[in-house]
């Protein structure tokens, strides 16, 4: 379990359980719609996701000199990934199937940001907008473009634990 | 197997409120949205909104908004819905459902509005 | 809001007769569009969802067609317990919008 104030992060189940996500954003996409994707979405959804980008301290140097930083940004993510993953655009219709890997995928958002931010220690969190509905029509191809991008999130995030659990664990 | 039963018929005065139960079972109630669709004596239906309970969202149809308040309480995997300042055509059945492509329905709550 | 016209809004057939029931939404709303049959006293049951997707236990007699505006619900073989009424709904866009119905009589 991550401690607050500074302290490492319980590196190795993070890496265990960014792994999971990495196997499950990929078994959840493409999600096989009703229709193909003949509609262009809003892109107001996707827009604003939050990447990891080189001034997070994701890097083996800004990990080993302060990893709070990288994991305040990856906290950030995993929380906004699981409030779409919540909301009307995957739950809504067109209906996922009961045995859709996005349950769990939602599930292991929540477990990993967990693991990261335990009670009674609070990271500011980047304001995630209140989420407007999205039509139905929209939303096969917010979900492959959300689950895309998911993708790209959570393969960064292992990359950054698995460097974590080799080197910086304790 | 899929079951979503709701609460008991209403009858209600002018001006008053009523809150409808929805209690859902055989699926795992935060994956899709509950809908609340209505029906006047002898009328067609009417969607009045949905919620999604995972995150807690809502869409409400602008004919009620202001009047129509939904809930959930996942730990019992139940919806609400209320609707404020009954009027006598609020007189209707209302009904829960879960995602449309999925035909799951509960049986309907008579609520009789009359002074 | 996207208007759902349905015709006719009644109809009377003999047990055997081909149904045919047309739904017209005054905007496109691609194949976005549920079929439901309601009987007296409960709630409606999908038969097509889609424009065209079967749904597992509806008897195969049931049939829909159509895209954009125009859709059809077809009844091969009118049977007794196909005496209701049957909706088609906007399933497109908000607000949901349903047909004003059409009721199947026995002539």
């Known amino acids: 379990r991550a401690v607050p104030g500074g302290s490492s992060p319980a590196w190795t189940q993070c890496q265990q359980l960014s792994q999971k996500l990495c196997t499950l954003a990929w078994s959840a996409h493409p999600l096989v719609g009703h229709m193909d994707l003949r509609e262009e979405g809003d892109e107001e959804t996707t827009n604003d996701v939050p990447h990891i980008q080189c001034g997070d301290g994701c890097d083996p140097q800004g990990l080993r000199d302060n990893s709070q930083f990288c994991l305040q940004r990856i906290h950030q993510g995993l929380i906004f990934y699981e409030k779409l993953l919540g909301s009307d655009i995957f739950t809504g219709e067109p209906s996922l199937l009961p045995d859709s890997p996005v349950g769990q995928l939602h599930a292991s958002l929540l477990g990993l940001s967990q693991l990261l931010q335990p009670e009674g220690h609070h990271w500011e969190t980047q304001q995630i907008p209140s989420l407007s509905p999205s039509q139905p029509w929209q939303r096969l191809l917010l979900r492959f473009k959300i689950l895309r991008s998911l993708q790209a999130f959570v393969a960064v995030a292992a990359r950054v634990f698995a460097h974590g659990a080799a080197t910086l664990s304790p | 197997q899929v079951q979503l039963v709701q609460s008991g018929a209403e009858v209600k005065k002018p001006g008053a409120s009523v809150k409808v139960s929805c209690k859902a079972s055989g699926y795992t109630f935060t994956s899709y949205g509950i809908k609340w669709v209505r029906q006047a004596p002898g009328q067609g239906l009417e969607w009045m909104g949905e919620i999604f309970p995972r995150s807690g969202q809502t869409i409400y149809n602008e004919k009620f908004k202001g009047r129509v308040t939904m809930t959930t309480d996942t730990s019992t995997s139940t919806a609400y819905m209320e609707l404020r300042s009954l009027r006598s055509d609020d007189t209707a059945v209302y009904y829960c459902?879960?995602?449309?492509?999925?035909?799951?329905w509960g049986q309907g709550t008579l609520v009789t509005v009359s002074s | 809001d996207i208007q759902m016209t349905q015709s006719p809004s009644s109809l009377s057939a003999s047990v055997g007769d081909r149904v045919t029931i047309t739904c017209r939404a005054s905007q496109s709303i691609s194949d976005y569009l549920h079929w439901y049959q309601q009987k007296p006293g409960k709630a409606p049951k999908l038969l097509i969802y889609?424009?065209?997707q079967s749904i597992s236990g509806v008897p195969s007699r049931f049939s829909g067609s159509g895209s954009g505006t125009d859709f059809t619900l077809t009844i091969s073989s009118l049977q007794p317990e196909d005496f209701a009424t049957y909706y088609c709904?906007?399933?497109?866009?908000?607000?949901?919008?349903f047909g004003q119905g059409t009721k199947v009589e026995i002539k």
């Open positions: 709904q906007n399933g497109h866009s908000f607000p949901y919008t």
């Open positions: 889609y424009a065209s």
């Open positions: 459902a879960a995602n449309w492509d999925l035909d799951y």
